[in-house]
């Protein structure tokens, strides 16, 4: 099986043209597009890629380009207009040279004869460097997802095609398609490779049947399989959670709403370092896992397991990897403890009462929106968030 | 404004060789992409040639490659196309034209064009 990538190696999504031979197709890749089949152009120069002059982008070119990246025809071909204003017009009579500075940062251009790529060429400093970009849309805009997994790099597999986003079929589905997902979409390695009903079943049209990739492919595309078949139904739908999804749970406490806190990462359960766990942290947390508002931070524990996880939020944010966070990978969480959390849908904040003392019932509204009934407000000290 | 005028067109025989020049009356001849199009009797101008501003780079039409050469002489504000191996369909209008934004691939970034200078090839 392949060794997981390491963090800081994960592949982009844009088209990489190193899968060809040299000279056997063109140096060309297409990035800050929707999906790998649009975007601007970017040619390579020996070691270094540099976007396409703009002014030289005509539609022969952006026909070549498609077709050589296997994405079809083109649909649209276009110029990205300059981020700063274009050079000056042309100088006039008498004006002393600029051509020594201008010349050297000339862009490359590709400049093709006809649409067929073995008709083009990349002209070095053709174009001086006006910040005009070519950019095309091709007709087989291919994409990929995964979604209804509660982030980017978990959930539903799905790709975009003939202008339709569908399934892929759970047939042979295994960790090494999944790979491909994973890493195609910078979600790092494959944790699970899930059969149909993990997730929730997609609605349209299945595009993938028998996947069957090694794990090295580029793109998902580039496996062998088969068309989706008619008797492959969405209760079969193939799904993937790679490394860098993060999922949590509160363990130790009474039930699922209260404890310690503990986030799933690049393949192992993770304790949070508490130095930086603060109300609105808590509260982010409690409410995404469907547990209310975050009634208390209990003194941590020592880790019980790596604490690496560091998140800083502003209170708003739906999940804790919307926040801005931190994985350690060197150390472990210095001078800190676990973090931990109540949040006020536990069942422990419902049975704090004693038999000896009479009950006296107190209502708290903690956070202007949730009401937690506290019954002998003595037996248990609540500090409020 | 620059001027360009071409030189050297004339008659000759297949497989024969020319040369063509253009010079141009702008001291700021080296801040231009220069080119070669041609037009043919009853045909759409098309390109032939083209070289950047310090003549690092050059791009040739298809049916041009390995017989023409481009080239320029930036101290003499001098461009010139190097024509060999000729044949009759090379018979045409060669126009020299300066872009300044791009190599003059495309008639749309051109920004001057000479008045031409007539090549006949007879078989």
């Known amino acids: 099986h392949p060794s997981p990538a390491p963090p800081d190696q994960l592949n982009t999504s844009s088209a990489e043209s190193e899968l060809w031979e040299p000279g056997e197709r063109l140096p060309v890749r297409l990035t800050n597009g929707s999906s790998s089949c649009s975007g601007t152009v970017e040619v390579r120069l020996e070691a270094s890629w540099e976007p396409a002059c703009g002014a030289l982008w005509d539609s022969r070119a952006a026909e070549a380009v498609c077709r050589a990246l296997g994405c079809g025809g083109a649909e649209a071909a276009s110029q990205l207009a300059p981020p700063t204003p274009e050079l000056p017009p042309p100088p006039a009579a008498g004006n002393t040279s600029v051509a020594a500075n201008a010349t050297l940062a000339g862009a490359p251009a590709l400049l093709c004869s006809g649409a067929e790529w073995r008709l083009c060429e990349v002209v070095e400093h053709a174009c001086r460097s006006d910040g005009r970009r070519a950019r095309v849309t091709c007709a087989e805009n291919r994409a990929l997802r995964l979604v209804d997994g509660g982030g980017a790099c978990a959930g539903r597999v799905e790709m975009l095609e003939h202008g339709e986003w569908g399934s892929v079929c759970d047939d042979t589905w295994d960790l090494e398609d999944a790979h491909v997902v994973c890493r195609q979409l910078g979600c790092g390695w494959a944790v699970q490779a899930l059969p149909g009903l993990h997730f929730t079943p997609g609605r349209g049209p299945i595009h993938r049947d028998q996947v069957n990739c090694s794990g090295a492919e580029a793109y998902l595309w580039d496996c062998p399989g088969l068309p989706g078949q008619h008797y492959c139904g969405h209760k079969e739908d193939a799904g993937a959670v790679c490394s860098e999804h993060q999922s949590w749970r509160l363990t130790g406490g009474a039930d699922r709403c209260e404890g310690q806190v503990e986030v799933h990462f690049r393949g192992v359960w993770n304790t949070v370092c508490d130095s930086e766990w603060y109300p609105s942290e808590a509260k982010v947390l409690c409410q995404s896992l469907g547990c209310g508002t975050a009634v208390e931070r209990p003194k941590g524990l020592p880790h019980s397991l790596s604490g690496r996880m560091y998140y800083s939020c502003n209170g708003e944010e739906l999940t804790l990897s919307n926040c801005s966070w931190r994985f350690n990978n060197s150390n472990l969480c210095s001078q800190s403890l676990a973090a931990r959390v109540l949040c006020s849908a536990s069942r422990s904040l419902h049975n704090l009462s004693t038999p000896e003392v009479p009950a006296s019932v107190q209502t708290v509204t903690i956070e202007s929106s949730v009401t937690v009934k506290i019954e002998n407000k003595e037996s248990r000290e609540l500090m409020l968030l | 404004q620059v001027q360009l005028v071409e030189s050297g067109g004339g008659l000759v025989q297949a497989g024969g060789s020319l040369r063509l020049s253009c010079s141009a009356s702008?001291?700021?001849?080296?801040?231009?992409?220069l080119g070669w199009f041609r037009q043919a009797p009853g045909k759409e101008r098309e390109f032939v040639a083209a070289i950047n501003w310090v003549g690092g780079s050059t791009y040739y039409a298809d049916s041009v490659k390995g017989r023409f050469t481009i080239s320029r002489d930036n101290s003499k504000n001098t461009l010139y196309l190097q024509m060999n191996s000729l044949r009759a369909e090379d018979t045409a209008v060669y126009y020299c034209?300066?872009?300044?934004?791009?190599?003059?691939?495309?008639?749309?970034?051109?920004?001057?064009w000479g008045k031409g200078t007539l090549v006949t090839v007879s078989s």
């Open positions: 702008e001291r700021t001849f080296s801040d231009y992409a």
């Open positions: 034209v300066a872009s300044w934004g791009a190599m003059p691939v495309l008639t749309h970034v051109i920004n001057y």
